[in-house]
């Protein structure tokens, strides 16, 4: 008779989670010489230790501290790109603009990107059937707490001009409930960060509106200004052309507005 297992509302742990984390760790440390010293087995042990045998609705940032310590990484603090609801374009951008970094370009972000994981209280098993959903079950679940922890640290490390890519196709271009809106915005350090520059990415080819005037962008500006950080905003009307011009800035068509 199978043992009773808690049924959560979200999808279960990603298939082959342990192997995936280790494979990614090996690949990352090979590609990034500055992280060659990292022991991937220890990273996995620390990752596992953060959630195994713990109730998946009772995870704390403290649980992830051993992993955070092992994954400590210095990225140029003035080359940070945050994003909200537009991950793919942000990642395409940093793949071309190699001196800029999203959270997923760091070891810990790279390890966990697009993965789901959770355990069960008092057993060493990983739950591949279901994991807590942030809305329907609980917010202090392993995945949410992980991203909250690494996002906070990433924002805290930022300095000078910080860029954020926002999705202009969404009803809330800036969403206070997103990780960017609820964590990163509030953890930028005013004594280090001079300006937050938002890039609003347009979806429609014929969309010529100035989305920097959107009420949610004004709300973001207000939050940032109250934190004594300057705010600027740019419309990216043609994301395809924008990426092309990052690749080939000397192209004659790249002098006009993108």
């Amino acid at each position: 008779v199978p043992r009773w297992r808690q049924q959560w509302s979200g999808p279960g742990t990603t298939k082959r989670f342990p192997e995936t984390v280790l494979a990614r760790c090996v690949k990352y440390t090979e590609i990034h010489p500055e992280m060659r010293h990292v022991d991937c087995q220890s990273v996995w042990d620390a990752f596992k230790g953060a959630f195994i045998s713990k109730h998946p609705c009772n995870i704390t940032e403290e649980d992830y501290q051993p992993l955070m310590k092992l994954g400590t990484q210095t990225v140029p603090c003035n080359k940070i790109l945050l994003w909200s609801r537009i991950k793919d374009l942000a990642h395409q951008f940093t793949q071309v603009q190699r001196d800029m970094f999203t959270l997923e370009d760091t070891l810990l972000g790279y390890l966990a990107d697009d993965l789901t994981w959770c355990g069960e209280f008092n057993t060493s098993k990983i739950n591949y059937q279901s994991c807590p959903d942030w809305r329907k079950d609980c917010s202090n679940n392993p995945v949410s707490v992980f991203w909250k922890t690494v996002s906070r640290r990433f924002a805290e490390a930022a300095c000078d001009v910080v860029h954020v890519m926002l999705n202009g196709s969404r009803s809330k271009i800036f969403d206070k409930n997103s990780t960017f809106g609820s964590v990163e915005v509030h953890n930028l350090q005013p004594e280090k960060v001079q300006t937050l520059e938002a890039w609003v990415i347009h979806g429609g080819r014929e969309d010529s509106r100035d989305l920097c005037q959107d009420p949610t962008i004004k709300e973001l500006e207000s939050i940032i200004s109250k934190r004594n950080i300057q705010f600027s905003c740019k419309n990216i009307y043609r994301p395809d052309k924008f990426l092309q011009c990052v690749k080939n800035p000397e192209d004659s068509s790249c002098t006009s507005e993108i």
């Epitope: 082959r16 989670f17 494979a23």
Partner: antibody
Framework: QVQLVQSGAEVKKPGASVKVSCKVS????????IHWVRQAPGQGLEWMGG????????IYAQKFQGRVIMTEDTSTDTAYMEMNSLRSEDTAIYYC?????????WGQGTLVTVSS | EIILTQSPAILSLSPGERATLSCRAS???????LSWYQVKPGLAPRLLIY???TRATGIPVRFSGSGSGTDFSLTISSLQPEDCAVYYC?????????FGQGTRLEIK
């Protein structure tokens, strides 16, 4: 305790196909991926292919590309390795193995003999 | 692809002697992902060492592994007649997983 139990020996004619099964117990195929390794008489161990969690797909050693298909049935926790267009040099013991990055566990092996 | 080269191809020693088998990689291998196997005719490969130096469950203490980077070795401190077999090193840090060509250990 992790166990991998493979199907029995097969004798095939050149040009035929063979499908070897590997039933796992003590864990599920959701947790770890299966790799296949063969050893021909008097030869060394040769990795044939296996699941790459980095890319989320099965990858094959160049030598076996297009001639081997590795599949799995997670409902029965059984992995399969099918090889087509068999030649006499495919005579070997075929092993399923699991536990990449951890402790490797091996099936008992399946002898496939290709002979006319 | 990481190529593993084992030496010697054949090693012939007497019981009680010390055997040292070498495995050299074409590029650096993360130690945690280097293993050693013992293979006897008709039997599945037996994992002896993983992580370059950790003995697998049930493996006698006379077997030990060492090395890092591109140079690894397996040592059998005092040979027993039952150690007659072919020994393979394996790396699994990168796909394709690769094996050395093997060292045949003969007991005189």
């Amino acid at each position: 305790q992790v166990q991998l139990v493979q199907s029995g020996a097969e004798v095939k004619k050149p040009g035929a196909s063979v499908k070897v099964s590997c039933k796992v117990s003590g864990y599920t195929l959701t947790e770890f991926s299966i790799h296949w390794v063969r050893q021909a008489p008097g030869q060394g161990l040769e990795w044939m292919g296996g699941f790459d969690p980095e890319d989320g797909e099965t990858i094959y050693a160049q030598k076996f590309q297009g001639r081997v298909i590795m599949t799995e049935d997670t409902s029965t926790d059984t992995a399969y390795m099918e090889m087509n267009s068999l030649r006499s040099e495919d005579t070997a013991i075929y092993y399923c193995t699991t536990g990449r990055f951890f402790d490797w566990f091996w099936g008992q092996g399946t002898l496939v003999t290709v002979s006319s | 692809e990481i190529i593993l080269t084992q030496s010697p191809a054949i090693l012939s020693l007497s019981p009680g002697e010390r055997a040292t088998l070498s495995c050299r990689a074409s590029q650096s291998v993360i130690s945690r992902f280097l293993s050693w196997y013992q293979v006897k005719p008709g039997l599945a490969p037996r994992l002896l060492i993983y992580g370059a130096s950790t003995r697998a469950t049930g493996i006698p203490v006379r077997f030990s592994g060492s090395g890092s980077g591109t140079d690894f070795s397996l040592t059998i401190s005092s040979l027993q007649p039952e150690d007659c077999a072919v020994y393979y090193c394996q790396q699994d840090s990168n796909l394709p997983i690769t094996f050395g060509q093997g060292t045949r250990l003969e007991i005189k």
